[in-house]
């Protein structure tokens, strides 16, 4: 946030930027939550914007028994491990091929014993508040899944006759770890020492970091004609005198009439 | 480039016997597996056997005792004898490899595949 000065007064201006603002030699460069001519001015909301998606990581391990483990397949760059991811991708493509937040699949690591796949589920969902009962949900459809799978597909005298089979003991899940996104962290984090004062307010969806100083919110102060501002001790209303009225009050409603003021003081003296 | 060529197909009457071979180039016999697939008309691929590098071999119900895989390192090439023929065995035998040592006989576990050799069982 930026405000321009022009004339003899920007000199002073410039060892006046407070807050944490610099002058570039035109205006003070204001820090994120600050504006005004002397970033003097605290912002009434803050951009949180979320991200459009949140991730989800599911480590898990599958025993493959339709392979023979050979040491090639250590090798991330050999045929063999390029030709097993290629058929383990497809496979679990199919597996999980209900599940919308279903994004694929990545081999970590190959090891003895048939062939033991350490291996991420990758899911991803639109952001939504409630977009982690989403991918809570989409990881227990991935669990029952998974299970159904290698308790189905495993081996009939030797041979298996799907596209992968399994032990249907080795499958374990290892560890979840869903991206998080707390608006409201970030949004006390970011109002730093206003923390106490700005809150996070939905709209359509969407996350707003605001203080009662921002209008057209539930939490929004009316200041009336008068202006409110932020201060260490909370948002306050800034009363107007116009040309007829005295304001007061601690949301401006209070309006005394300049004339009644002055005529009392005119019968006094 | 793995390049499998298929040969030895043709008529046979019930009950004789054909050897189909397959020549590979690009893909060495001493890792992997290989297989013979068959698919006959209006019928979806399926699994004849399977010869892996470690030795181990593996044959669908329907062709126990009656067929025999086998493969010669040094030329490259797979074998299939087929004894026994029955007018069911009719089908395009395709030849198929992996570099993964395979105990898989469903097509979708496969990667190369050749262009296949007609065999007729008819009287």
């Known amino acids: 946030r930026t405000t321009t000065c022009f004339g003899d007064g920007c000199q002073n201006t410039a060892s006046r930027c407070k807050n944490g603002g610099t002058w570039d030699g035109l205006k003070c460069q204001c820090p994120n939550l600050y504006y005004g001519e002397l970033c003097e001015e605290v912002v009434s909301s803050i951009d949180i914007g979320p991200p459009e998606t949140i991730s989800a990581q599911m480590e898990l391990t599958v025993t493959v028994t339709s392979v023979k483990f050979t040491e090639e397949l250590k090798n991330h760059s050999s045929q063999e491990f390029q030709e097993f991811k290629q058929t383990f991708t497809e496979q679990m493509n199919i597996v999980y091929s209900g599940i919308p937040e279903y994004v694929g699949v990545n081999i970590t690591k190959l090891r003895l014993g048939s062939v033991v796949v350490e291996h991420d589920v990758l899911l991803r969902t639109k952001y939504t508040p409630e977009y982690k009962t989403v991918l809570d949900n989409a990881t227990e459809v991935v669990k029952e899944k998974i299970t159904k799978v290698t308790t189905q597909q495993i081996m009939i005298n030797d041979i298996c006759s799907d596209m992968m089979c399994f032990n249907t003991t080795g499958t374990q899940v290892q560890n979840i770890t869903v991206t998080q996104y707390d608006p409201e962290e970030d949004c006390r984090k970011m109002a730093k020492e206003y923390g106490d004062y700005f809150v996070v307010e939905y709209r359509d969806q969407k996350p707003y970091c605001i203080s009662p100083c921002e209008p057209g919110f539930s939490v929004s102060k009316n200041c009336n004609l008068g202006k409110c501002q932020m201060s260490l001790s909370g948002p306050q209303c800034l009363c107007v005198t116009t040309e007829t009225h005295w304001y007061s009050g601690e949301t401006c409603n209070q309006g005394t009439q300049k004339s009644l003021v002055y005529g009392h003081h005119h019968h006094h003296h | 480039e793995v390049q499998l060529v298929e040969s030895g197909g043709g008529l046979v009457q019930p009950g004789g016997s054909l050897r189909l071979s397959c020549a590979a180039s690009?893909?060495?016999?001493?890792?992997?597996?290989m297989s013979w697939f068959r698919q006959a008309p209006g019928k979806e691929r399926e699994g004849v056997a399977i010869i892996s590098s470690d030795g181990w071999t593996g044959y669908a119900d329907s062709v126990k005792g009656r067929f025999t895989i086998s493969q010669d390192n040094a030329k490259n090439s797979l074998y299939l004898q087929m004894n026994s023929l029955r007018a069911e065995d009719t089908a395009v035998y395709y030849c198929?490899?992996?570099?993964?040592?395979?105990?898989?006989?469903?097509?979708?576990?496969?990667?190369?595949w050749g262009q296949g050799t007609m065999v007729t069982v008819s009287s």
């Open positions: 690009g893909f060495t016999f001493s890792r992997g597996s």
């Open positions: 198929a490899a992996s570099f993964l040592v395979l105990r898989a006989l469903n097509p979708k576990a496969w990667h190369y």
